[in-house]
């Protein structure tokens, strides 16, 4: 309930906000959950706490893990968890699903794409914007404050948009990138009984104990803008938020609108530091709309390490 997922790329700045809120005068203590080691507040450290914020300047893959923040108020302490995953930089252009922020959709009248999480950083204009890894050029694209405006939006404008900016901390500069999908609303549309594209029914997913695992629930609901459509994960028939395991979180993946116009949604289930007991759970991918609900069940199995005998 009081846990938030955050992710970033190695060698980039990552700033994480404590999920619990309080007054500015309250002190906030941060700990690395696995070791219960206090995070320093001195800015000379690469990873340091600054009130409600935890700063990785820059982040390293080894920083991945669950961090605990405690907001100390006069009457009780409020505890929150930040589930941080730092990924290696991809050599190719593709941005994987797990690095995607929530999808935004636009139309001819409203085509703003906000740069995700930018409000946490000390940045100065201009923002750089890329679509499918290509720098955006031309008068149709206007970088304004923390968002991109596209004039005369067309269906071809749908795609993955990356914003890039510089965070400044005490005179040192750190790069930050964030990517989200942009879909273009189709005025004409219809809705169908949900079709789950992934995972397959009764799929067995191989995972490695101690590593992170991602499961994507992907379903299509019809064509064009959908009045009601949702995908979600359940654990043993319980909502993720009610299950109470901070290592297991779901994040909205990208809304997709394929060339055939189908409206699809993704929900990524992120399991940090896979444990034996995770193999015993039943993972249900649920897709629902006004027509009804469809469910595909997944189970996890241990991936056997490859033997390296001579």
């Amino acid at each position: 309930k009081f846990s938030k997922q955050s992710w970033g790329l190695e060698n980039e700045a990552l700033i994480v906000r404590c999920p619990r809120q309080g007054k500015p005068s309250y002190t906030v203590d941060w700990y690395y959950s696995q070791t219960n080691k206090s995070i320093p507040t001195q800015e000379r450290n690469r990873v340091f706490a600054s009130g409600q914020l935890l700063k990785f300047l820059p982040a390293a893959v080894a920083d991945s893990g669950i961090y605990t923040c405690i907001v100390r108020s006069p009457t009780f302490n409020r505890t929150g968890y930040a589930n941080v995953t730092i990924y290696k930089k991809q050599s190719d252009c593709n941005v994987p699903d797990y690095l995607m922020y929530s999808t935004v959709s636009g139309s001819e009248k409203n085509s703003k794409i906000y740069c995700p999480t930018i409000d946490l950083y000390n940045w100065t204009a201009p923002l750089e914007w890329f679509k499918n890894c290509q720098a955006l050029q031309g008068s149709r694209y206007r970088a304004h404050k923390s968002f991109l405006v596209i004039d005369n939006v067309m269906t071809e404008d749908a795609g993955d948009y990356t914003c890039k900016f510089i965070h400044n901390e005490n005179g040192a500069n750190y790069s930050v990138t964030a990517t989200r999908s942009f879909t273009v609303k189709d005025e004409q549309g219809f809705s169908l009984f949900p079709v789950i594209g992934a995972p397959a029914q009764n799929e067995i997913k191989e995972v490695e104990i101690g590593k992170n695992a991602n499961l994507t629930c992907s379903a299509c609901f019809g064509k064009g803008t959908q009045f009601l459509a949702a995908v979600l994960w359940q654990l043993n028939g319980t909502k993720i938020t009610d299950f109470g395991e901070p290592r297991i979180q779901q994040e909205e993946g990208q809304n997709q609108s394929f060339s055939n116009g189908l409206a699809c949604l993704d929900m990524v289930l992120r399991i940090a530091d896979v444990k034996e007991e995770d193999l015993l759970l039943q993972y249900d991918c649920l897709a629902l709309n006004l027509h009804g609900l469809r469910r595909h069940t997944v189970r996890l199995s241990r991936k056997n390490p490859i033997d390296h005998h001579s």
């Epitope: 009081f2 999920p19 619990r20 500015p24 100390r72 006069p74 009457t75 929150g80």
Partner: antibody
Framework: QVQLVQSGAEVKKPGASVKVSCKAS????????MNWVRQAPGQRLEWMGW????????TYGDNFKGRVTITRDTSASTAYMELSSLRSEDTAVYYC?????????WGQGTLVTVSS | DIVMTQSPDSLAVSLGERATINCKSS????????????LAWYQQKPGQPPKLLIY???TRESGVPDRFSGSGSGTDFTLTISSLQAEDVAVYYC?????????FGGGTKVEIK
Amino acid sequence: QVQLVQSGAEVKKPGASVKVSCKASGYTFINYGMNWVRQAPGQRLEWMGWINTYIGEPTYGDNFKGRVTITRDTSASTAYMELSSLRSEDTAVYYCAREGDGFAYWGQGTLVTVSS
Amino acid sequence: DIVMTQSPDSLAVSLGERATINCKSSQSLLYSGNQNNYLAWYQQKPGQPPKLLIYGASTRESGVPDRFSGSGSGTDFTLTISSLQAEDVAVYYCQNDHSYPYTFGGGTKVEIK
């Protein structure tokens, strides 16, 4: 500059519900909680509850538990307060106020009149 | 709940004179963790929302004239207007900013004598 703009006045019948909105601008909405306070005619200010705008977790005053629901829509930078099973003594001006050391920013207030 | 008791209920002061409002809380508003007193003072004029004057018992909110000052600790607090101006005519409230439910005093009406 920070602004909290509330929805307009409402007239409701006893037993009905009312939902008041509070649109925030001029700051990052999810950085600060949002409180709801009401003021009945000639009465002292009464705190109803607040919401953690980042994770959506509400906390309610005991006097309102079971009747009040505080929610938020981060994409619209808007907080909502819904009060159900209205009675005549719920006639009051309802305010949203941004959390802080003291409430430095308030909405303009929404008058809710409960009358048969 | 913490009960906030204000006195007097109303106060008539000549222009340029000092106005003093007292506020007593049923429990201490001092947080030993940071030595802050979580008490706030507000000014409210008819048809307007309250305006924050003082937080932390004695810290003036930015933009508030320096004739307004707050003092006190624990359970006893005072708001002082050192030299009353015409625009200070209003109702003044103290607030427990320490613990839920946040509670307010009954208000003190300040008028010009």
